[in-house]
């Protein structure tokens, strides 16, 4: 099949990185600068993707493959194949139409992207709050109050840095 078709269509003999030039009696010409063909037999080369503005080049265009973009510092990729760049925010913030805004009380965001999410409700699992939540961190749930015997502490106190009575060396 391949052989018979290549006799009918000389363009089938043009490999990736070239195009079948109708203006030059269908000979295979190299793709011009800033263009590529990732398969053979193309009658034109495809224009390379240009990474401009907040996009930066992650992989240069070659004669056989398109360029790949990512985002400049302070921005992150959105969408498959980094089709968009979105502004980073600080931890404890989320991006709104008016820019970066602090998470409301009761919510947190531990990343530079995404939205503020509600703190975990420990009581839904029958647990108590061990460490309070902040704008940047979720609450830490501890054992349920019933699990704690009277007088027992829910947190093990830290070991002293050195034994009392010993002077530092």
């Amino acid at each position: 099949f391949e052989r018979t078709r290549s006799l009918q269509d000389p363009c089938s003999n043009c490999p990736a990185g070239t195009f079948c030039d109708n203006n030059r009696n269908q000979i295979c010409s190299p793709c011009p600068p800033n263009s590529f063909s990732s398969a053979g037999g193309q009658r034109t080369c495809d224009i390379c993707r240009q990474c401009k503005g907040v996009f930066r080049t992650r992989k240069e265009c070659s004669s056989t493959s398109n360029a790949e973009c990512d985002c400049t510092p302070g921005f992150h990729c959105l969408g498959a194949g980094c089709s968009m760049c979105e502004q980073d925010c600080k931890q404890g913030q989320e991006l709104t139409k008016k820019g970066c805004k602090d998470c409301c009380f009761g919510t947190f965001n531990d990343q530079k992207r995404g939205i503020c999410r509600p703190w975990t409700n420990c009581s839904l699992d029958g647990k108590s709050v061990l460490v309070n939540g902040t704008k940047e961190r979720d609450v830490v749930c501890g054992p349920s109050p019933a699990d704690l015997s009277p007088g027992a502490s829910s947190v093990t106190p830290p070991a002293p840095a050195r034994e009392p009575g010993h002077s530092p060396q």
Epitope: S12, S38, A39
Partner: nanobody, 126 residues
Framework: EVQLLESGGGEVQPGGSLRLSCAAS????????MAWFRQAPGKGLEWVAR????????DYAESVKGRFTISRDNAKNTLYLQMSSLRAEDTAVYYC???????????????????WGQGTLVTVKP
């Protein structure tokens, strides 16, 4: 998960028109070349048309040139095939396919494409 779903097929009279759609999901649609193939009853797979990642360059089989138009909307992750002046010999199951990032084969060869839809039937009869 990469998915391609064709729609828009049906029965039409000779000289009529149809527009096929291919909805893509699960991957960076705008980064890949796309193509349409067809398979007539009892025949092999035939390449129809191919479109660059950005819609900038197109290639057509001689049998459909001037009658079919391939296009894409990267914002909607959709590939189209506008078919006009349809003939009985255009009767086939039409498939959309994603072009590989690199292929040593040419664009008319199925091996150049890695993902395929399930197809939509186009029937042209009086």
């Amino acid at each position: 998960e990469v998915q391609l779903l064709e729609s828009g097929g049906g029965e039409v009279q000779p000289g009529g028109s149809l527009r096929l759609s291919c909805a893509a999901s699960g991957w960076a649609f705008g980064n890949y070349g796309m193509a349409w193939f067809r398979q007539a009853p009892g025949k092999g797979l035939e390449w129809v048309a191919r479109l660059a990642w950005n819609g900038g360059s197109t290639d057509y089989a001689e049998s459909v040139k001037g009658r079919f138009t391939i296009s894409r909307d990267n914002a909607k992750n959709t590939l189209y095939l506008q078919m006009s002046s349809l003939r009985a010999e255009d009767t086939a199951v039409y498939y959309c396919a994603r072009q590989r990032s690199y292929s040593r084969y040419d664009i008319r060869t199925p091996q150049t494409y890695d993902y395929w839809g399930q197809g939509t039937l186009v029937t042209v009869k009086p």
